[in-house]
Structure formats: structure tokens, C-alpha cells
Interface confidence: low
């Protein structure tokens, strides 16, 4: 049966979803276990011109071999205002000084990056040492690069489309995810549904997605259900500021009782099917419906509070 609920974009003041993911448009992770220099390459695209970027490098001490030296090659297409955090890491940074401005002096060794196309930049980097990771990111707001983490099966890093960087790289896009909402026809009451659909990633290892839900309503004003649907290898850690009904695939737990896993359900994996699920749970409003790439952290902020959906 078709569910009549015309999903329309919701204004950011009614609902906003941000997320952190390891999925990249192009990337690779390789192992270079005996290399003296760990080389990472980031190609960053900023479609709207000058941007601010928070870039954090984290070192993992493996077998007491850290620190080895790190070369980070930063290729950007427009002006970037960079906050770099790389405490205690023997970092060499190669970048275009006319495009990258540091919010404070970086305190690391720097090299001017030649104005080469991507393939030549990779070759230039590879001449300095085996490339551990390379990624192409579109409009990042923050990036976390974990050093000494490379779990790749490759011995040579070659950019490939639609890659999962695993623990090596996590990033947060600047643009929040598209949030849509609708009224479920023929359902009375003020119960609202928040539906989050996480799409399958490019590697199928077990994943926990942390879902932070912040609804700006007085607790008594709210009758809500949170529907979380994802691939079978995804479990959920829920951090919510309201009590609400939970309906998920896989297993879920709450941040306040992380050790207590609760079994979820088999849920439909289509938007129509999930809208049907919301209707079956007596929701009259889908306050937010979001589809995301496989993420590690998702934050939902909404201020619908039942019965007052506004689309943009």
C-alpha cells in the first residue's frame, strides 16, 4: 500500500543533521609498515570559495615505534583558513602557500607544493616515500587523520572511486545533510517520527553509528519515535535528550547504558517502506527524514515538537 506523505525539504531552523564519515569520493589506504616517512595526501575541493578547515592529526603508538616522520600533502582548489592540530607529531607539510592560511603559525616544517595536476601530485608525494593514504574530499569542515592506523590490504596507494578510509580518516562535510519532512495523511494525533537511513558503505565490517538526537521541546510536549535503518553490520549508540520510542535495524544501546545491547528489528530498506513503518507506529508527522552515507557520528537537531511541521 502506498503511503501518502510528500517529503519536502525542512528549513534548517526546524531540523539539521550533521555527520562524520570515512566515506570519500576517491581514496586509498595502503600499508607501508617499514617506511621511515608516512605519506598522506589530501585533495580538498571547496566549491564556495574561501573556507575554514579544522585538520587534526592523531598519532597511535604502535609497538613503541612512534614517532616516525609524517609528510602531509595538502592540495586545495581555493583559499583555506586552516586550523591545524598535530601536537607532538614530527610533521612535514607540503601545501600551496598562496591558498592556505594558518590561523596560527603551524610550528611544523613546510614545503611549497608545486602547482601540479592530481596525478603528478601523487607522483611527487610517492617520490618522497610510499603513500599510506590519499583521499579526495568535497567541502570538508573538519578532518581527523589517524596516523599509524593504515589497515589497507594494498601495498600501493592508487586513488579509486567511492572508498571507505576506515579508521585512517574521518571527516565532516560543511553542508548538512538534506532533511525532509511530511504529514502522514489520515493519522490523527501529534506523534512525530524522525527517520535516519544510513546507506551501505564500501566496506562491510561491523560499525557502530553514534546518533545524537537533540529535540528542543519540553519533555512533556513530545511524543516521538526514532527510526534508524542501516545495513546489517551497523549497530547504533543513541545519545538522546528526550525519551522516545526507538525502532532500529541491528542492535542498539544508549550512551548512558552502553553495555546494554537491545535487539532491533528487520525494517524496510526503502523510503516508502520506512514511511509505512512510521505510519504503523501511529506517527502523524515525519519531522525529519534523512539519508546519509555510512557515518560514524550523526547529530540530529530538530525543533518540531509535534504538529507544527514547516517545510522550506
Amino acid at each position: 500500500e502506498t503511503v501518502h506523505c510528500d517529503l519536502q525539504p525542512v528549513g534548517p531552523e526546524r531540523g539539521e543533521v550533521t555527520y562524520t564519515t570515512s566515506q570519500v569520493s576517491k581514496g586509498c589506504v595502503a600499508q607501508a609498515p617499514n617506511a621511515i616517512l608516512e605519506v598522506h595526501v589530501l585533495f580538498l575541493e571547496f566549491p564556495t570559495g574561501p573556507s575554514q578547515l579544522e585538520l587534526t592529526l592523531q598519532a597511535s603508538k604502535q609497538n613503541g615505534t612512534w614517532p616516525r616522520e609524517v609528510l602531509l600533502v595538502l592540495s586545495v582548489n581555493s583559499s583555506v583558513f586552516l586550523h591545524l592540530q598535530a601536537l607532538g607529531i614530527p610533521l612535514h607539510l607540503a601545501y600551496n602557500s598562496s591558498l592556505v592560511t594558518f590561523q596560527e603559525p603551524p610550528g611544523v616544517n613546510t614545503t611549497e607544493l608545486p602547482s601540479f595536476p592530481k596525478t603528478q601530485i601523487l607522483e611527487w608525494a610517492a617520490e618522497r616515500g610510499p603513500i599510506t593514504s590519499a583521499a579526495e574530499l568535497n567541502d570538508p569542515q573538519s578532518i581527523l587523520l589517524r596516523l599509524g592506523q593504515a589497515q589497507g590490504s594494498l601495498s600501493f596507494c592508487m586513488l579509486e572511486a567511492s572508498q571507505d578510509m576506515g579508521r585512517t580518516l574521518e571527516w565532516r562535510p560543511r553542508t548538512p545533510a538534506l532533511v525532509r519532512g511530511c504529514h502522514l495523511e489520515g493519522v490523527a494525533g501529534h506523534k512525530e517520527a524522525h527517520i535516519l537511513r544510513v546507506l551501505p558503505g564500501h566496506s562491510a565490517g561491523p560499525r557502530t553509528v553514534t546518533v545524537k538526537v537533540e529535540l528542543s521541546c519540553a519533555p512533556g510536549d513530545l511524543d516521538a519515535v526514532l527510526i534508524l535503518q542501516g545495513p546489517p553490520y551497523v549497530s547504533w549508540l543513541i545519545d538522546a535528550n528526550h525519551n522516545m520510542q526507538i525502532w532500529t535495524t541491528g542492535e542498539y544501546s544508549f550512551k548512558i547504558f552502553p553495555e546494554k545491547n537491545i535487539r532491533g528489528f528487520k525494517l524496510p530498506d526503502t523510503p516508502q517502506g520506512l514511511l509505512g513503518e512510521a505510519r504503523m507506529l501511529n506517527a502523524s508527522i515525519v519531522a525529519s527524514f534523512v539519508e546519509l552515507p555510512l557515518a560514524s557520528i550523526v547529530s540530529l537537531h530538530a525543533s518540531s515538537c509535534g504538529g507544527r511541521l514547516q517545510t522550506s
Epitope: 550533521t18 592560511t101 603559525p105 537533540e214
Partner: antibody, heavy 118, light 106 residues
């Protein structure tokens, strides 16, 4: 809607202390870089200092004029920013604004007046 | 520290006039941000990264410049535009503001 509401201003004697608060709502406070900017009566804007986000280990930065006397802190669980002002001088008299930095100062509070006078 | 010098410090003009506010940095900066302030009110974000208007700012405003010289231009002054405008840089620590330009009705 982003809202920043300052409080805690008032009259204090030179050498005294005061703590300003800024209650934030309408955005993910823990992800935000938050600043204090002040404006002496009839004068221009002066940056006081900043505290970075959780991802940046809450790093703090200060203007030379307040370094060692002022401390910026935050409580992400309460969505609140603080400015602890010690050893106050008459030249610290100003309206203090709490602001959010996101590419630029995209949100400002209404300000709270601090008067340092004997 | 990078010093920011705004000129003129005050500007007297009529509704419909074109107004140009200049901000000169003591050394090169990556880009400039602008804020509008009316008496007794908090500053409002007005333009960022040199040429991008903040949300809700009318298109009669435009920003331009590079290096040390930046301008905020109002193509046709409207009554609500009479206010003080501040430029600001953060290409190098510490963050600094210009001294402000007061746009007054002639």
C-alpha cells in the same frame, strides 16, 4: 535559531573580579569556536579571546591586553561560555559580546556592560 | 599585530548615493570580514571572506579587495543602511578590527 545571551555584567572596583556567562542555543555548541569581543563606550570593537571546540581540545587564545588576567572556559554539557575577569582595570570598561566564529563572527549576543570604577 | 585602518572614519551621504568604505591592513591579509552596528545594538555579520554577503544582507552591498586594500560598497544608500561598519581580519594572530566607519545621513 542561534541565540547567545550574555549575563554577569555590572559595576566592579579596579583590581576586582567578575565572571560573565553566555548561554547558547540553536546550534551544536560543542562544535563551535566561541569568542568574546568587547566595545568600550563610544569606541570600536576589540577582540578579547577565543576558546576552540572539543575537536580542538578547547584550546584558548587571548588578546595581549587581557592575557594573564582573563580566562575563557566553556561547559559543553550546559551550552555555556564563560569569561573570568581578574585584576580588572578601568580600561576594561566595555560592553562584552559573546560571539560564534564560523568563517567569521556569524552570531552575536546582545552584550553585557562591565563598568570598572572606584 | 596587523593594524586595520578604515577610511573615512565618518561619511555623510544622502539616500540613493553610492558609498564606499575602505579598509587598509598594515600587511597583506587573505580576506576581510565586515560587520554592521547600529547605536545600542550588537554588531551584525555583514560580509565574509571579502565578497560574500551574510544571510539577509541586501544585494546593493558588495565587497572586494585583496592584499592590503579592501572595500565595502553600497550602490544606493537606503535609510536602514545608516550605521557604523567595521572590517576585521584573522589571517594572522591576533584577530583585529578596523576602527569603524560611521555612515550618516546628510
Amino acid at each position: 535559531e542561534v541565540q547567545l545571551v550574555e549575563s554577569g555584567g555590572g559595576l566592579v572596583k579596579p583590581g576586582g573580579s567578575l565572571r560573565l556567562s553566555c548561554a547558547a542555543s540553536g546550534f551544536t555548541f560543542s562544535d563551535a569556536w566561541m569568542d568574546w569581543v568587547r566595545q568600550a563606550p563610544g569606541k570600536g570593537l576589540e577582540w578579547v579571546g577565543e576558546i576552540r571546540s572539543q575537536a580542538s581540545n578547547h584550546a584558548t587564545y587571548y588578546a595581549e591586553s587581557v592575557k594573564g588576567r582573563f580566562t575563557i572556559s566553556r561547559d559543553d554539557s550546559k551550552n555555556t561560555l564563560y569569561l573570568q575577569m581578574n585584576s580588572l582595570k578601568t580600561e576594561d570598561t566595555a560592553v562584552y559580546y559573546c560571539t560564534r566564529w564560523r568563517r567569521f563572527f556569524d552570531s552575536w549576543g546582545q552584550g553585557t556592560l562591565v563598568t570598572v570604577s572606584s | 599585530d596587523i593594524q586595520m585602518t578604515q577610511s573615512p572614519s565618518s561619511l555623510s551621504a544622502s539616500v540613493g548615493d553610492r558609498a564606499t568604505i575602505t579598509c587598509r591592513a598594515s600587511s597583506s591579509v587573505s580576506y576581510m570580514h565586515w560587520y554592521q552596528q547600529k547605536p545600542g545594538k550588537a554588531p551584525k555579520p555583514w560580509a565574509y571572506a571579502t565578497s560574500n554577503l551574510a544571510s539577509g544582507v541586501p544585494s546593493r552591498f558588495s565587497g572586494s579587495g585583496s592584499g592590503t586594500d579592501y572595500t565595502l560598497t553600497i550602490s544606493s544608500l537606503q535609510p536602514e543602511d545608516f550605521a557604523t561598519y567595521y572590517c576585521q581580519q584573522w589571517s594572522s594572530n591576533p584577530l583585529t578590527f578596523g576602527g569603524g566607519t560611521k555612515v550618516e545621513i546628510k
